[in-house]
Interface confidence: medium
């Protein structure tokens, strides 16, 4: 009975040609959508002139189909029981699932101005930047279309920089026709408890972005976990989007299309300051913005973004300290809408439904030498957008799953 089932499961979750797991792993059978909500700034002049609170109004969803491309360069290594691959990126706009078009305009922080003023802090260089910012008619805020903001536009200020720099700016630029990886994961042939766990990412076992244990690449990519998941487990996974490994804990039993699944959620503790969660000390990389590592709920990933002052948080600064959201008006965090969860079928370890939610923010600081930033009296971590990437097992696949897996066990 149970032993036979365990044996069958162990065989079918191995990542090699011919297994159920492999077929769904190479190309996900689930439709994955990424919804974007853009934070449209309502009072750009008041902020720039008076250092007022930034009033934002979220606009969305703008929906794209993602993760529809099969993994590439899939290569088995029989010697160390791993399989390596590239995960290609692609996004297709879905007008019927969106509130508007890719041509919709938004008032957002000027990404290039904020980034350049942060990266180049030398006073003389800032005077030159100021000259170029004025010459290009750039300002603290800009109006951009959705397509430009997400996928890239030629920045007029950077275009004037007299030495070679990338003049194209976009929150996800470059995206289409690029790939994430190389990932090398254990295929589970020799040890099923290691299946899908990442051995190396881009040829390394650590990231070089963080100190100590924070820099480790832990767990899987969250698409699946080793089988026979227990409620007491802490599920580790790595997300290249946020340049770190993170973890999820059991929250509740959920019935998904007749399949019993465990809902694992990212707990607030994962976003806590080192004061509350000492394990997070190595995610605090500087003392000023973090107020001596007492702020929480935002992650400075600038090291992972060529020095650009990108901060990742949960949407609407859910689980973030009050000082982070205080300069921003118009945010309404709530767990139901803004937390991340994974619904995992415990026998196979497959993630059958998920909602990955995150917010992209940019730091902008006052600058005496840069005219469009010189009236600011405080630092702002400015929300640009938040996203909700979701996938749910299809009805047909759910029927198959029920009959072949959960049905046999029950």
């Amino acid at each position: 009975g149970d032993l036979l089932i365990q044996k069958t499961i162990k065989k079918q979750v191995v990542l090699e040609e011919g297994t159920i797991a492999f077929k769904n792993w190479v190309k996900t059978g689930t439709e994955v959508y990424r919804q974007f909500w853009i934070f449209d700034v309502q009072n750009p002049q008041e902020v720039m002139m008076n250092s007022s609170n930034i009033q934002v109004k979220q606009r969305g969803p703008y929906t794209y189909r993602v993760r529809f491309l099969a993994k590439e360069n899939v290569t088995q290594d029989a010697e160390d029981n791993t399989v390596s691959f590239l995960q290609p990126n692609g996004a297709i706009f879905e007008p019927s699932l969106s509130v508007g078009t890719e041509a919709d305009n938004f008032t957002v922080l000027n990404l290039a101005v904020a980034a350049a003023s942060h990266i180049y802090q030398n006073q003389f260089v800032q005077m030159i930047l100021n000259s170029l910012i004025n010459k290009s008619k750039s300002s603290m805020f800009q109006v951009r279309t959705l397509r430009e903001l997400l996928w890239g536009y030629r920045d007029p200020f950077l275009s004037l920089v007299p030495y070679p720099v990338t003049t194209t700016v976009g929150l996800f630029y470059p995206y289409n026709n690029t790939a994430d990886g190389v990932y090398k994961v254990f295929n589970g042939k020799d040890n099923i408890s290691k299946v899908a766990i990442i051995d190396t990412y881009k040829g390394k076992r650590n990231l070089s972005y963080w100190e100590s244990h924070c820099d480790m690449i832990n767990g899987t990519d969250a698409a699946s976990f080793p089988p026979f998941v227990e409620k007491s487990q802490v599920l580790q996974f790595f997300s290249s989007d946020i340049c770190r490994s993170i973890y999820a804990v059991f929250e509740s039993d959920v019935n998904l299309k007749g399949i019993p699944v465990y809902r694992f959620v990212l707990p607030s503790k994962a976003f806590a300051s080192p004061v509350e969660n000492p394990d997070n000390y190595c995610f605090c990389t500087e003392k000023i913005i973090s107020k001596n590592c007492t702020s929480y709920g935002v992650l400075d990933i600038s090291k992972c973004k060529e020095g650009r002052p990108v901060y990742i948080s949960l949407p609407h600064f859910l689980y973030a300290s009050p000082d982070v959201s205080e300069p921003i008006d118009g945010l309404n965090p709530n767990e139901e809408e803004h937390r991340t969860y994974l619904d995992i079928e415990p026998i196979t370890g497959f993630t059958l439904q998920f909602a990955k939610r995150l917010q992209v923010n940019l730091l902008v600081k006052p600058s005496e030498k840069i005219q469009v930033l010189k009236n600011l009296k405080r630092n702002y971590i400015v929300p640009i957008l938040w996203l909700n990437e979701t996938g749910t097992i299809g009805d047909e696949k759910a029927n198959m799953f029920r009959s072949q897996v959960t049905g046999k066990i029950n």
Partner: antibody, heavy 129, light 105 residues
Framework: AVTLDESGGGLQTPGGALSLVCKAS????????MGWVRQAPGKGLEWVAG????????AYGSAVKGRATISRDNGQSTVRLQLSNLRAEDTGVYYC??????????????????????WGHGTEVIVSS | ALTQPSSVSASPGETVKITCSGS????YGWYQQKSPGSALVTVI????NRPSSIPSRFSGSTSGSTGTLTITGVRADDEAVYFC???????????FGAGTTLTVL
């Protein structure tokens, strides 16, 4: 052709309020920022107020800040300037101005006066008791 | 405020240059007024852009913090006061020059 017609000027009393209206035609009004510029007798030009195409960005000149309100009605293709607590130094010709763009380009505390591509004929305001 | 010469003069057919100095790299608009209190006409906006109704003899340029309006082959009906407009970062305010009176001899 672009036409901007101002109205509402005339003799005003100190401490009172005025309301000037600019009626636009000959272009897609909702696509352009609009503003007001004034000229005191025998003097140069002075920025009064500006508003972005969608009504979002608003800016006022330092001499009228706190006393002026600019509003626009894209359906009617009009932009209105209301000025309260009138003073003698508010006397002058008030011109309606159209930006070449959807918003004014802003410096650290006000817009650049460099992108006006059309003007009204002006309406004269005299503040006197 | 922006600094421009109070007056310039030229004979018909000559080239006239009117300058406007700001306090940093900037952009300029040039506005023509034929008599005080009368209508204004934009001859150049954004330093170099000429409205379609303005003859090609009017052109604009910038170098550093100075904007220049050039009238090539000046004509009698170009006689007017020319105001420049920009932003003055020394006073942190929207600014116009005091105006340059062009006299065609």
């Amino acid at each position: 052709a672009v036409t901007l017609d101002e109205s509402g000027g005339g003799l005003q009393t100190p401490g009172g309020a005025l309301s000037l209206v600019c009626k636009a035609s000959g272009f897609d009004f909702s696509s352009y920022a609009m503003g007001w510029v004034r000229q005191a007798p025998g003097k140069g030009l002075e920025w009064v107020a500006g508003k972005a195409k969608d009504g979002g960005g608003t800016a006022y000149g330092s001499a009228v800040k706190g006393r002026a309100t600019i509003s626009r009605d894209n359906g009617q293709s009009t932009v209105r300037l209301q000025l309260s607590n009138l003073r003698a130094e508010d006397t002058g010709v008030y011109y309606c101005a159209k930006s070449a763009y959807g918003d004014w380009f802003y410096g650290s505390s006000g817009p650049y006066a460099d992108s006006i591509d059309a003007w009204g004929h002006g309406t004269e305001v005299i503040v006197s008791s | 405020a922006l600094t421009q010469p109070s007056s310039v003069s030229a004979s018909p057919g000559e080239t006239v240059k009117i300058t406007c100095s700001g306090s940093s790299d900037s952009w300029y608009g040039w506005y023509q007024q034929k008599s005080p209190g009368s209508a204004l006409v934009t001859v150049i906006y954004d330093s170099t852009n000429r409205p379609s109704s303005i003859p090609s003899r009017f052109s604009g340029s910038t170098s550093g913090s100075t904007g220049t309006l050039t009238i090539t082959g000046v004509r009698a009906d170009d006689e007017a006061v020319y105001f420049c407009g920009s932003f003055d970062s020394s006073t942190d305010s929207t600014a116009f020059g005091a105006g340059t009176t062009l006299t065609v001899l």
